[in-house]
Interface confidence: low
């Protein structure tokens, strides 16, 4: 803590300007009025204060606002935000998307820090749900943000927010997360025509049920192998050879390269070999001709 000392004559700050960079830490503490600092926070960012000097400025704000800074100050914190602890941020009530953007901008290019995570958590909880504009902002700064949320947290994402999601935002999502997001995407894009719909829904298909994959197979969508390999195994297993052929279109030839990997491997094991042979790809491992095919639910119980 900086020792309390009287401000030298003539050094009392009338405004926040560049002359303050020449002040020693104790002079800043003694000569800068906290209320003045709060009203002129927008100027701090343009002045090349040292980290030590920023510590002093933060200390002054902490004394002025022991219960947490008002949003008018938070919005203009700039680089001073990097000095905040998660405990400081938990005292804030941030409601403006502009404030959130301003603070995320300060941390741009860096990994999500505990401070940023706390800020986002406070903001989203304050709003009650992850609305489209918030999601748009967060994924712009942190493409992996959506996949960092638990399925429970994702359940508060309204379907209309799905329009803000880009394919790269889902790269690190696991099947449980896609299970939650897929029905929302399906609802969000339901009024689009076939080809436009497939382009939008494609990234979410890791959460799609068998019925929806069957429906897509009737729409000439030509799903690529990368998307097919991300489908839920339990959704792929009931598909017939003809349905997979229609679903993949010209990409069906890629099955050969993936025949030892899930979900292709598991799917092959459920198909009749003579059906697989119709693809002309040399896929092996299907049920030999003449064998009894058990009901799928029975087969699950036996395996």
């Amino acid at each position: 803590e900086v020792e309390k000392t009287a401000c030298p004559s003539g050094k009392k700050a009338r405004e926040i300007d560049e002359s303050l960079i020449f002040y020693k830490k104790w002079e800043l503490e003694a000569c800068v009025d906290a209320a003045l600092l709060a009203t002129q926070m927008d100027r701090v960012n343009a002045i090349p204060f040292t980290y030590e000097q920023l510590d002093v400025l933060k200390h002054k704000l902490d004394e002025l606002y022991p219960q947490g800074y008002p949003e008018s100050v938070i919005q203009h914190l700039g680089y001073l935000f990097l000095k905040m602890s998660p405990e400081d941020i938990r005292k804030w009530n941030v409601t403006s998307l502009e404030t959130l953007k301003a603070l995320l901008e300060v941390n741009k290019g860096h990994e999500m820090s505990p401070q940023v995570a706390t800020l986002i958590d406070r903001f989203v909880k304050g709003r009650g749900q992850l609305d489209k504009d918030t999601l748009d902002t967060l994924t712009a700064f942190y493409p992996g943000y959506l996949c960092s949320l638990s399925p429970e947290e994702l359940s508060s994402v309204p379907p209309s927010s799905i329009w803000a999601v880009r394919p790269q935002d889902l790269d690190t999502c696991d099947p449980r997360q896609l299970d939650v997001l897929y029905p929302k995407a399906r609802l969000a894009f339901q009024n689009m025509n076939g080809s436009e719909y497939f382009v939008k829904i494609q990234s979410f298909l890791g959460g799609a049920p068998t019925e929806d994959l069957k429906a897509l197979s009737q729409q000439n969508v030509s799903m690529d192998l990368a998307t097919f390999m991300k489908l839920r195994t339990d959704a792929v297993l009931p598909l017939t050879v003809a349905e997979v052929q229609k679903l993949l279109g010209p990409h069906v030839e890629g099955l050969k390269a993936e025949e030892r990997h899930r979900p292709v491997r598991d799917w092959i094991l459920r198909q009749r070999q003579d059906d697989l042979d119709t693809l002309g790809l040399g896929l092996q491992g299907g049920i030999p001709n003449g064998y009894l095919v058990l009901d799928l639910s029975m087969q699950e119980a036996l395996s």
């Epitope: 399925p151 359940s155 209309s160 299970d179 029905p183 609802l187 009024n191 049920p209 019925e211």
Partner: antibody
Framework: QVQLQESGPGLVKPSQTLSLTCTVS??????????WSWIRQHPGKCLEWIGY???????YTNPSLRDRLKISVDTSKNQFSLKLSSVTAADTAMYYC???????????WGQGTMVTVSS | QSALTQPASVSGSPGQSITISCTGT?????????VSWYQQHPGKAPKLMIY???NRPSGVSNRFSGSKSGNTASLTISGLQAGDEADYFC???????????FGCGTKLTVL
Amino acid sequence: QVQLQESGPGLVKPSQTLSLTCTVSGGSISSGAYFWSWIRQHPGKCLEWIGYIYYSGSTYTNPSLRDRLKISVDTSKNQFSLKLSSVTAADTAMYYCAREGAGYVFDIWGQGTMVTVSS
Amino acid sequence: QSALTQPASVSGSPGQSITISCTGTSSDVGGYNYVSWYQQHPGKAPKLMIYEVSNRPSGVSNRFSGSKSGNTASLTISGLQAGDEADYFCQVWDSSSDHVVFGCGTKLTVL
């Protein structure tokens, strides 16, 4: 022909948890085309959407009830359920389960079950 | 209370036409075509009559029609019959809250 049937106690004490189950017959709850919803109708006849569940377990609920509400699904029994905790007299209503299709349309409804909150 | 406004009651004689209005905002009725209408007889569950403003499910009489102008949706019943006497509810998707909202219903009396 898909049919829905609600079941559960008709009387619940204040501060307790209201539990209802909807059984789907004539079709599979695992059909990816539908959301399975709960809607209630207060004595003054206003209808209030409570929330829905997808066969995968994903839920979306009315923000005004979210803190007290849990909707779950049991695909093996072709059922979905509602639990509303800390009930008060304001939760007295006719509770309906319904099937929601594309376009936010409730095309099939159960016959409803009346729940009274009273000590 | 619902954010959708419906008249509490309307009446008409057999053979006549009546119209029930449902007024909302640009974030629900005005902004989207997700407007449905339901009929409810006493002691019964609601029944879907109109969806997406003007579409009729199979099995619903063509005497029932729907339309929309600005922030107001309307249900028109032509050739009124005694069996049409019931409560009628409008329902929309509200983009501001991202969930469905119902009107509080209109009681139709066939004189």
